[in-house]
Amino acid sequence: SQPQAVPPYASENQTCRDQEKEYYEPQHRICCSRCPPGTYVSAKCSRIRDTVCATCAENSYNEHWNYLTICQLCRPCDPVMGLEEIAPCTSKRKTQCRCQPGMFCAAWALECTHCELLSDCPPGTEAELKDEVGKGNNHCVPCKAGHFQNTSSPSARCQPHTRCENQGLVEAAPGTAQSDTTCKNPLEPLPPEMSGTMLM
C-alpha cells in the first residue's frame, strides 16, 4: 500500500484526504493541517512546512478543527437578555447558556440570543410539555378530562380532580376544567354559599 501523504502535500483536484483535519490552500495548491479544537494558527503553512498551531489564550476558544488565525473571545451569558450559564467557557467550547427559569428563547441566531417571559396559561389550561425547556413560548392546551387548573400561570399543571369517595366523602359539586370537585360529609347538607368547598 502507498504511504499516506503528510501535510503539506500537493493537491491538483483541490480536495484533501482528511476533510476534517486538513484544508486546501489555494495560493500554493497544497493540503495543510487544520488546528485542533482549543488552538489557532500561529504560523500558516507553505509548500515546505505545515501549519503551526498554538493554544488559545485564557478566556478564548475555538470549537472545531480550524485554520483561524485567532481564537474567539469567550462571552458571558447576558442576564439582561434573560440568559444564565450552564457550563463555563473552555479553550474548546464557548460558554453554554440557557434561558432563565420561566423564560423562553425569543431570538435565535445559531444559538439563543434573547429570552422572554413565558406567557401565562389561563385557568382550565396548562403549558404543553416541550422536548427542550426554554425552546419556545407556552402553547396552552385544555386540561384533559378529570383534571383542573385554577390559576393564570406559565408553569402550573392541571391536577386530577379530588375523588371524594377516597376520603369517605360524597360529591357535592362536580369538578370542571377550572375547579376541583366539591366534597361534603354524607350526613350534612351543603349550604348554597359553601359551593366549591370541601366540608369536613
Epitope: S42, A43, K44, C45, S46, R47, I48, D50, V52
Partner: antibody
Framework: QVQLQESGPGLVKPSDTLSLTCAVS?????????WGWIRQPPGKGLEWIGY???????YYNPSLKSRVTMSVDTSKNQFSLKLSSVTAVDTAVYYC??????????????WGQGTMVTVSS | EIVLTQSPVTLSLSPGERATLSCRAS???????LAWYQQKPGQAPRLLIY???GRATGIPDRFSGSGSGTDFTLTISRLEPEDFALYYC?????????FGHGTRLDIK
Amino acid sequence: QVQLQESGPGLVKPSDTLSLTCAVSGYSISSRNWWGWIRQPPGKGLEWIGYIHYIGNTYYNPSLKSRVTMSVDTSKNQFSLKLSSVTAVDTAVYYCARETGSDGDDTFDIWGQGTMVTVSS
Amino acid sequence: EIVLTQSPVTLSLSPGERATLSCRASQSIGSSYLAWYQQKPGQAPRLLIYGASGRATGIPDRFSGSGSGTDFTLTISRLEPEDFALYYCQQCYSSPITFGHGTRLDIK
C-alpha cells in the same frame, strides 16, 4: 532593529558534535516566523540545514536529518543547532537566519554574520 | 531535490551597464517560489527578491526579478560599484530548500 548572532566553538574534532546558538535581539523569537540554519563551505554555495519554530516544530534537510537536532529557548530568545558525528565536509560558515514570516514564503530576510566552524583533529 | 543551475558562473561588466543573471530549475517551480540573494566577501547573504519578482525591503528599484516555471532572471538595470558581488538564487517550492551555486558579478 532585528539582529541575529551566532556563537559556538570554532574548532570541532571529527566524530564530535557541533553545537551552535543563535541569539535574537530586537525581535521576539515567539512570533510567527520560522528560524533557520544555513551553511556555506569555504568557496562553495549555500546549503539549507533546517528550520525550527518557537513551538518546537522542525524541518530538516533530508541529507542531514539523521545528524541534526534543533531546539529553541524562548526565555533566552535564542535557538540552537546540534550536528553530530561531524567530519571534514562539515567545515563551513554557519549562518542563522529568520524566515520572512510572509504567507508561504520560505525566504530569509535577516541573517546573522555567520560563524566559521572547522572540523579537524 | 530541485537543482538550481545559475549562469553565467562569472559575469564581467562595467558600472552603468545592465546585468542579466539566469537561474534554471531542474523542474517547474511555479511563479512564486524563487528568491535572489546578494553576498559580498566576508558578509552574510542579503535578500533582494522574493516570490520571483517582489523586491525586499530597502532594495533599490534597479534590481528586478522575473520568470516562472523553470527559467528565472535577475536584472540589474544600471550597475553601481556596490553591486559587484556574488548572487544566489533559492527555491522554496519543495523540500529541501535549495540554492544555486552562484554567479559572480565582476568589474570589467
